[in-house]
């Protein structure tokens, strides 16, 4: 298949090559793959600009492109059966070389959903418009083509080759020609960065005359992550030109001797490297040795450096990297300490709030304080908790055990409280009698009285009503007649209760409030006392107390 490398751009640790040729996406990928690469990724705006540059290079040399709107394959594809995902930047497409779903995209138009065939992406170039960095090629999605039928307007493709590192271009100090041969079989005489394992052939001389010298170099790793040719001194130097040709091939300063010879030098603050051409900063911080947020600080006379960490961090054993200080190891808080990146915060247990003497101190929350009591009636504060109680004639009720509910004495267990009629009232009850009967002095029994056609005696008086003020479960007074053994109606008991005596008050068991360990109880959001962080203090997401269900074992709340 005819695909010619027309252009190459190397930058960072990758090279991009642009090829013209009407190939299917699979053929294009195969071509890239044969030389150790893949169809190009366009994972960022910067990468899009690199790809645009290599396409611009190609278009400058390529006169015979047939379509005004030309398309060049890139390595973005969606397999058959995989459907469009409009929520993702890549819409369900993925890069052929693998890798994460990247945030950058530049779709030409809204994609139509189609899962039945493989889809491939090309860069859409309008050849009637100049290629500008501000106008990056759009992504066009379509069929992937097949051998001999690449698809509409497909004019070529872009490959990407990744490398361990790059060498700087060789500097010539006199007339000559450098030819670089890359590992992906491209030859070029002008690369702004030359990939690792490339060869450089240098032919010195004017070109028309006999060449006097030739050199061969390989771009290799001279030390960890240090890539260089290993040449020393400028190449193709000529006494005829001295420093006048390309600054003698020197990186910074060029110094001529009287005999036409010259040497490279460096400006103050820089030193000459082993290649006798390149200058590097004397400042040891210029190589950014510090990592993880550490700042490089020059030592005396600029000779060495130390790394310094922001507040709340410390240097690790390498002395180059910052790690979080665990301030909680020093127990700075009265109750709970939460280590955070660059700081910490104190939290109080449930039922406590920030306050009291000292940093990180906690004090008991008085849940029974005026205006904040969660109890319907009685409230007793305890250290870190509270419990609710109810007045006589009421019992604790509600899911959270903070409400009070009237006890219906007329249906209490242990037998009927009244001999005849029973009238339940808020917080109490009264007995009554059927017509012709009157209530005995004990308030429970009925005795035969004068015949009367009026209503049954003993309904509650007005003053009996509303005894249980504050109850959230009001009940209407009801009479519950039942038939006793002699045929007289009696109340039907339903709740267990000891036999009533005038001096036996009805009291509630205290509510057990528990910490948020999974048991029910009063749960209060932890409240934050303070924070020390580079980013400043953080507000808690605290809130009002919420109340859980009642525990029936009659113990006080604890956290």
């Amino acid at each position: 298949t005819g695909a010619d490398t027309e252009a190459v751009v190397c930058v960072g640790t990758a090279c991009y090559t642009a090829h013209s040729g009407k190939l299917s996406a699979a053929e294009a990928q195969n071509h890239c793959n044969q030389n150790g690469g893949n169809l190009a990724t366009v994972k960022s705006k910067e990468e899009a600009q690199h790809v645009q540059r290599v396409l611009a290079q190609l278009l400058r040399r390529e006169a015979a492109l047939t379509a005004r709107m030309s398309k060049f394959w890139i390595g973005l594809q969606r397999e058959k059966g995989k459907c469009l995902d409009p929520s993702l930047p890549l819409k369900g497409f993925s890069w052929v070389g693998g890798g994460e779903d990247t945030p950058y995209s530049n779709w030409h138009k809204e994609l139509r959903n189609s899962c039945i065939s493989k889809r491939c992406v090309s860069l859409l170039l309008d050849l009637s418009q100049p290629l500008l960095p501000s106008r990056l090629p759009k992504w066009s999605e379509g069929p992937c083509g097949s051998p001999g039928s690449p698809g509409s307007n497909i004019e070529g493709f872009v490959c990407k080759f990744s490398f361990k590192g790059m060498c700087r271009p060789l500097a010539l100090g006199g007339p000559g020609q450098v030819t670089y041969t890359t590992p992906f079989q491209t030859t070029s005489s002008s690369l702004e960065a030359v990939p690792f394992a490339s060869a450089a052939n240098v032919a010195c001389g004017e070109g028309d005359k006999d060449e006097t010298q030739s050199h061969y170099f390989l771009c290799k790793e001279k030390a960890p992550d240090v890539f260089d040719w290993g040449s020393s001194g400028p190449l193709c130097v000529s006494p005829k030109y001295g420093c006048n040709f390309n600054n003698g091939g020197c990186h910074q300063d060029c110094f001529e001797g009287g005999d036409g010879s010259f040497l490279c030098g460096c400006r103050p603050g820089f030193r000459l490297l082993d290649d006798l051409v390149t200058c590097a900063s004397r400042n040891p911080c210029s190589s950014s040795p510090c990592r993880g947020g550490a700042t490089c600080v020059l030592g005396p006379h600029g000779k060495n450096y130390t790394c310094r960490c922001p507040q709340g961090y410390q240097l690790d054993s390498s002395q180059l990297d910052c790690v979080d200080v665990d301030e909680c190891q020093d127990s700075p808080c009265a109750q709970e300490c939460v280590n955070t990146p660059g700081g910490f915060r104190c939290e109080c247990w449930v039922g406590y709030e920030p306050g009291g003497p000292g940093e990180g101190a906690c004090q008991d929350v008085d849940e029974c304080a005026l205006g904040r009591s969660p109890c319907a009636q009685g409230c007793t504060n305890t250290d870190g908790s509270f419990h609710c109680s109810c007045e006589e004639g009421y019992v604790l009720a509600g899911e959270d055990g903070t409400q009070c509910q009237d006890v219906d004495e007329c249906v209490g267990p242990g037998g009927p409280l009244c001999d005849s009629l029973c009238f339940n009232t808020q917080g109490s009850f009264h007995c009554g009698c059927l017509p012709g009967w009157v209530l005995a002095p004990n308030g429970v029994s009925c005795t035969m009285g004068p015949v009367s056609l009026g209503p049954p005696s003993g309904p509650p008086d007005e003053e009996d009503k509303g005894e249980k003020e504050g109850s959230t479960v009001p009940r209407a007074a009801t009479a519950s007649p039942t038939r006793g053994p002699e045929g007289t109606p009696k109340a039907t008991p339903t709740t267990s209760r000891p036999s009533l005596s005038s001096d036996a008050p009805i009291t509630s068991a205290p509510l057990k409030m528990l910490a948020p360990s999974g048991s029910p109880g009063v749960w209060r959001e932890p409240s934050i006392h303070h924070a020390t962080a580079a980013s400043g203090p953080q507000e808690p997401a605290g809130g009002d107390s919420s109340v859980a269900t009642q525990n029936n074992d009659g113990t006080d709340g604890q956290k």
């Epitope: 960890p224 040719w229 040449s231 180059l320």
Partner: antibody
Framework: QVQLVQSGPEVKKPGESLKISCKAS????????LNWVRQMPGKGLEWMGR????????DYNGKFKGQVTISADKSSGTAYLQLSSLKASDTAVYFC???????????WGQGTLVTVSS | DIVMTQSPDSLAVSLGERATINCRFS???????????LYWYQQKPGQPPKLLIY???NLASGVPDRFSGSGSGTDFTLTISSLQAEDVAVYYC?????????FGGGTKLEIK
């Protein structure tokens, strides 16, 4: 398998020169750094220099610069260490060592004992 | 040049016991790429050195797992968890971060 085979022991007089060879096999000779390491009797190891046979690029330890020359012949897969103006203090075992992709010295020659004595 | 100090000069340990050799460098060997360019070599009498540990903590091919390497940017340790008779040798640390490559002075390990 990777092998580095060095030339045999040498006895030299002070002021003479000497060229030790190291024949490599079992790997792509041109694509790995080849180091030379000295070990004086009863002493530790000292790195002298290295060569990249692919293009002949060399690096030397400043301590040995001017006294030693490292070269290589790609076609035969052989590296050389030349010692000039020998002194009694050059008496040592000289090792050739391959540098691997992890910057380790992974394969060592058996060593060449050089004795300089009048 | 990066200077290294190896300690102790010699060490006697009983068979089956743990042996520890230390090496300190004048400069951090932790590269900005996250790799620490520290190596350990073993040299038995009359033999060339043999690579034991590369890049601080990685065991070279064929090396028993009783050998381990650890450390930080400047301080490193070679540990033999249970000394065997065949471990009697001189051990060297080395750095390959910056030219010239340098070796520690060596630690002679013997059986007590």
């Amino acid at each position: 398998q990777v092998q580095l085979v060095q030339s045999g022991p040498e006895v030299k007089k002070p002021g003479e020169s000497l060229k030790i060879s190291c024949k490599a096999s079992g790997y792509a000779f041109s694509s790995y750094w080849l180091n030379w390491v000295r070990q004086m009797p009863g002493k530790g190891l000292e790195w002298m220099g290295r060569i990249y046979p692919g293009d002949g690029d060399t690096d030397y330890n400043g301590k040995f610069k001017g006294q030693v020359t490292i070269s290589a012949d790609k076609s035969s897969g052989t590296a050389y260490l030349q010692l000039s103006s020998l002194k009694a203090s050059d008496t040592a075992v000289y090792f050739c060592v391959r540098g691997d992709g992890y910057w380790a010295m992974d394969y060592w020659g058996q060593g060449t004992l050089v004795t300089v004595s009048s | 040049d990066i200077v290294m100090t190896q300690s102790p000069d010699s060490l006697a340990v009983s068979l089956g016991e743990r042996a520890t050799i230390n090496c300190r460098f004048s400069k951090s060997l932790l590269h900005s790429n996250g790799i620490t360019y520290l190596y350990w070599y073993q040299q038995k009498p009359g033999q060339p050195p043999k690579l034991l540990i590369y890049q601080m903590s990685n065991l070279a091919s064929g090396v028993p797992d009783r050998f381990s390497g650890s450390g930080s940017g400047t301080d490193f340790t070679l540990t033999i968890s249970s000394l065997q008779a065949e471990d009697v040798a001189v051990y060297y640390c080395a750095q390959n971060l910056e030219l010239p490559w340098t070796f520690g002075g060596g630690t002679k390990l013997e059986i007590k």
